[in-house]
């Protein structure tokens, strides 16, 4: 069964800056990755970035930088200032659309009492939805 993992980290250098990393553990070809916050994409969440393996990347504030890390993982840096900046308990979700498995999504937030800049290695987050 495919899995999606999500890792959220607060940057030590900029305490209101977040890095979200997501990965897909599945057998298919990824056709789209959508990163959202405030809940799953399409269920009250707000899209931060969309990464397409052939058409490139689109991102929206407060997203500062979305990138592919490997063929099956991505990272997103969020700007940490202004009214739309994230807070420590914000939920971030990553949805991977792949062929032939379909769409798989998982969410995560900053671990409680986590030290800035430190985080556990990514582990698969609970799968919230498989379309």
């Amino acid at each position: 069964t495919p899995e999606v993992w999500v890792q959220v980290r607060m940057e030590a250098t900029e305490l209101s800056s977040f890095t979200i990393r997501c990965g897909f553990l599945g057998s298919g070809s990824i056709s789209l990755v959508t990163v959202s916050w405030g809940g799953p994409n399409g269920a009250g969440g707000t899209t931060l970035a969309v990464l397409h393996p052939e058409r490139g990347i689109r991102q929206w504030a407060p997203a500062r930088q979305a990138r592919w890390e490997t063929q099956s993982s991505i990272s997103l840096i969020l700007e940490g200032s202004g009214a739309s900046s994230p807070c420590a308990n914000t939920t971030f979700c990553c949805k991977f659309a792949s062929f032939p498995e379909g769409s798989w999504e998982a969410c995560g937030s900053l671990p409680p009492s986590s030290d800035p800049g430190l985080s556990a290695p990514p582990t698969p987050a609970p799968i919230l939805r498989a379309d």
């Epitope: 250098t13 599945g26 298919g28 990138r67 592919w68 490997t70 063929q71 099956s72």
Partner: antibody
Amino acid sequence: EVQLQQSGAELVKPGASVKLSCTASGFNIKDIYMHWLKQRPEQGLEWIGRIDPTNGNSEYDPRFRGKATLTADTSSNIAYLQLSSLTSEDTAVYYCARFGIYPYFDYWGQGTTLTVSS
Amino acid sequence: GIVMTQTPKFLLVSAGDRVTITCKASQSVNKAVVWYQQKPGQSPKLLISYASNRYTGVPDRFTGSGYGTDFTFSISTVQAEDLAVYFCQQDYSSPWTFGGGTKLEIK
């Protein structure tokens, strides 16, 4: 137009160090990871490592730790590969390649030939 | 790191022939395999990503397939301009690793 322009060929003596450059145009290196690769004559490609120009964080193949140092100057859009304690085994063509906007190396530099000889 | 074993090392074929190159990963890499073509004196160029997705502008005579540990790359009808070295590469996990390459020569 996206381009990665690498510095010219180098001939250096054993034990010396060398710094190769990769100048990006048509995009901002802060938007990608810059990877460096090594290719010896009639041999395969070896991955040296990658740098995140945004923060300078780099990751290396264990075989190149202590041999290679990756840096980047985001103000001038240039990535660098420094190689130290050179030996004949370091004689090769070195490539920079971008990764991140797409999930593969979509653009490569033309390569820099490094010859280590006394 | 993951070892990518590519075979054969050399292929001598005639124009119009079909060729197949295989790449075997030492552990599962799902579909995180890319195939590159490197013509003499040039940098590598992407042909296939995700094991089977043809890159923009790549002729449809080039195909890739596979999943897990076993991957194949084929040229259905070899043409003279296909003279090159072909590499597989995995980016499933760091360090990125490449197959040893297959040198394709045309009779």
